[in-house]
């Protein structure tokens, strides 16, 4: 509500806009008949400095000139970049109670002259787009700075447009709104940017370009693919492009891939044949365009086309294995197992498997289809049998895989020697062996088969197996291997018509068992004691049990117990001991040992042998 500048004026020399580091003189003058009413000579003019509306300094000591009661000149130095407000006030010294009265004020701007704009770059997006240029303005000037973009070209024409930068907005890009058309392909354009503010002006170096240098085609659109005769490996990719495009780049990859297949296509006219696609595979396709073979810029990549190639008939060989179990004197159960084809072999969704069991001499054939990866049949024990399996999808079936059904462990001379199983790390086991010593027929391949030694595993879970060439003597097994579980591992050596095998137990990691075996009964037979027990529950074994220990001592004795160590066999659950005295009461217990150590003891049982002990 104060009428500012009614009392006087404030002026700045050399100007209200000054370069950084310069000084300025600010003069504050009272208008005639203004000032302190009673004592004009007591007029005191003071100058206050404000930055961001905050009083930062009273410039009382910076007076360089004083007409008492009429005007004062102050010198200001070391002004920081940006805007500083100075307010002149009148202080009537005879009246201490009244605050100084504002006379007038001035804003001084400190900045720098603009640097020449650099790195001018112009772009037109698409044949129907408009020319937009951007540049680097250089250092901030802290002043309102006007920029003029000037584009000169054919037909004696110059186009120009302006914008400005200040503390609220930055100007480093302008769209001229004008379109350069292909008829100007050979023409040259010159662009320059001029910057001007109150402290000076500067111009960029002229930048020359042609239509081809700056026009970036729009990315192709409406991308589609047509698979020839529903082929899964050949397709024609089609798209729409701007009319002047002469070069395209195509990239495509399966969706789970990390590297693109790249193709350059000249004068494709929106069409290109691809011949190396993988059937039944999700692909991503993208296309980019260019207006000139050597010059110009590539468009952005198009939006992705995602599609799955059609199926083709499966290729590859199924990996088959089997188990034989005699049911009675003239019948056996054959269980066939096979591994799923990998996607590149299946080339589609496998709908079913065709399984055939054939007796070679009598020409008996059992055929069936199944959607599972196993098949079980009861067949006569006589005759030579062969099995074959093929996989079928909507386009056809794979070539059948044949396997001769032989007695897998029937020939001792074919049994591999020195089979060992070493834990490599948490989830695999290294199995090694030596070839059969006196095989009377050549080993065609080895099969390493494994399954967890848990109750019902033979019936509940299919086996895992690896096929190993005959010149290899080791296998690293990792499929379905878990720590702290014991696996039965068999190494089969197969010839054309015979099989031999050796068995071992192994684990990938072990701990001492959680508990010892539970003694269920102690019986006396023919001057020997038979200790019977139940095995440690499967989850508590924590690896392969190497042996059991039976401990005993006289009931109240403090002596060390005696012990008997038994090699672990899964089928065994009793063992005789014969070194106990008759009519002495003993305490007995058992422990189990893995490669990691011994379990705590199982339950204790007391027993007093009656008969004569040896």
């Amino acid at each position: 509500n104060i009428d500012v500048c009614k009392l006087g004026t404030v002026t700045v020399q050399p100007a209200p806009v000054i370069p950084l580091g310069s000084a300025a003189n600010i003069s504050c003058s009272l208008n005639p008949k203004q000032g302190c009413s009673h004592y004009p000579s007591s007029n005191e003019l003071i100058l206050l400095k404000f930055v961001n509306d905050v009083l930062v300094e009273n410039l009382h000591g910076k007076k360089v000139h004083d007409h008492t009661g009429h005007s004062s000149t102050f010198q200001v130095t070391n002004l920081s970049l940006g805007m500083t407000l100075f307010v002149c006030k009148l202080n009537c010294s005879n009246s201490q109670k009244k605050p100084p009265v504002p006379v007038c004020g001035v804003e001084i701007s400190v900045g720098v002259a603009p640097e020449p704009p650099q790195n001018i770059s112009c772009v037109q997006e698409g044949e129907n787009g408009t020319v937009a240029c951007s540049w680097n303005s250089g250092k901030v000037t802290y002043l309102k700075t006007n920029y003029t973009l000037q584009l000169s070209g054919p037909n004696n024409l110059t186009c120009q447009k302006q914008c400005f930068s200040d503390n609220r907005q930055n100007c480093n890009r302008l769209d001229l709104g004008i379109n350069l058309s292909p008829d100007l392909a050979e023409s040259r354009f010159i662009v320059r940017v001029t910057a001007i503010n109150d402290l000076g002006n500067s111009s960029s170096l002229p930048h020359t370009f042609t239509f081809l240098d700056i026009v970036i085609p729009l990315p192709p659109w409406d991308i589609r693919i047509n698979f020839l005769n529903a082929s899964g490996s050949r397709g024609t990719l089609q798209w729409e492009d701007e009319g002047q495009v002469v070069l395209n780049q195509l990239r495509y990859q399966p969706l789970n891939s990390t590297s693109w297949n790249m193709v350059n296509a000249t004068n494709a006219k929106g069409k290109y044949d691809l011949r190396d696609l993988r059937p039944f595979t999700e692909y991503e396709f993208q296309i980019s365009s260019k207006l000139h073979l050597s010059g110009g810029s590539w468009s952005n990549w198009s939006e992705s086309l995602r599609t799955r190639t059609p199926e083709e008939e499966p290729v590859g060989i199924l990996d088959i294995w089997y188990m034989k179990q005699d049911i009675d004197y003239d019948r056996q159960q054959i269980s066939l197992f096979w591994k799923s084809l990998n996607p590149s072999e299946a080339r589609g969704k496998i709908l079913h498997y065709q399984v055939t069991l054939q007796e070679v001499t009598k020409k008996t054939t059992l055929q069936n289809t199944t959607r599972h990866t196993s098949w079980t049949r009861v067949i006569p024990r006589t005759g030579a049998w062969t099995a074959s399996v093929s996989a079928a999808n909507s386009k056809g079936a794979s070539a059948p895989t044949h396997i001769n059904i032989v007695d897998l462990c029937g020939t001792g001379l074919l049994a591999p020697h020195q089979v060992s199983a070493k834990s490599e790390n948490m989830d695999n086991i290294l199995v090694t062996w030596q070839p059969p010593k006196k095989a009377d027929s050549a080993v065609r391949e080895y099969i390493v088969e494994w399954r967890a030694l848990q109750p019902g595993s033979i019936t509940k879970f299919p086996p895992h197996w690896l096929r190993i060439p005959p010149d290899n003597m080791s296998a690293l097994i990792s499929e379905n291997i878990k720590p702290y579980i014991c696996y039965e591992i068999r190494v089969h050596a197969l010839s054309e018509s015979q099989g031999g095998c050796s068995s071992i137990r192994g684990d990938s990691k072990h701990k001492a068992p959680v508990s010892g075996p539970h003694i269920t009964a102690i019986t006396e037979k023919k001057e020997r004691l038979f200790i019977s027990w139940t095995h440690i529950p499967f989850p508590e074994q924590r690896g392969c049990i190497l042996h059991y220990r039976i401990y005993w001592k006289e009931r109240d004795s403090t002596a060390q117990p005696e012990l008997c160590e038994i090699q672990y066999r899964r089928s065994q659950n009793s063992h005789p001991i014969s070194s106990l005295q008759p009519r002495v009461t003993y305490v007995l217990w058992m422990t189990a040992v893995t490669a990691a150590g011994e379990s705590p003891q199982g339950n204790e049982r007391e027993f007093c042998p009656q008969g004569k002990a040896n």
Partner: nanobody, 127 residues
Framework: QVQLQESGGGLVQAGGSLRLSCAAS????????MGWFRQAPGKEREFVAA????????FYTDSVKGRFSISGDGAKNTVYLQMNSLKAEDTAVYYC????????????????????WGQGTQVTVSS
């Protein structure tokens, strides 16, 4: 339909200044290019300057660059041509013209691409 009306022409000494105005009526010119052409006796009509309303871009022929300045007042639907440092060879009838999109470099300076024309105003520069 767009009507264009020029004014501001007259006789001026070499080195002097004139300001031509072109008022448009009939519809807004927000997407148009408004241009000035001139035709001297016995010569073809030639492009002088143009203003692209939507982009705010100005176009000049080389012979007037730096001397003439085109501007517009959207509220009044009027385009102005400020002519300074006039020369005898600037003597001509000055026509205001307007064109609809698209706006191509190849078309800006060519009279056949302009759909609407004014009657013209005479500018004479005496030496």
């Amino acid at each position: 339909q767009v009507q264009l009306q020029e004014s501001g022409g007259g006789l001026v000494q070499a080195g002097g200044s004139l300001r031509l105005s072109c008022a448009a009526s009939g519809r807004t010119l927000s997407n148009s290019v408004m241009g000035w052409f001139r035709q001297a006796p016995g010569k073809e009509r030639e492009f002088v300057a143009a203003l692209m309303w939507s982009a705010g871009s100005e176009f000049y022929t080389d012979s007037v660059k730096g001397r003439f300045s085109i501007s517009g007042d959207g509220a009044k639907n009027t385009v102005y041509l400020q002519m300074n440092s006039l020369k005898a060879e600037d003597t001509a009838v000055y026509y205001c013209a307007a064109k609809n999109p698209p706006h191509r470099w190849s078309d800006i300076g060519k009279s056949p691409h302009y759909e609407y024309w004014g009657q013209g105003t005479q500018v004479t520069v005496s030496s």
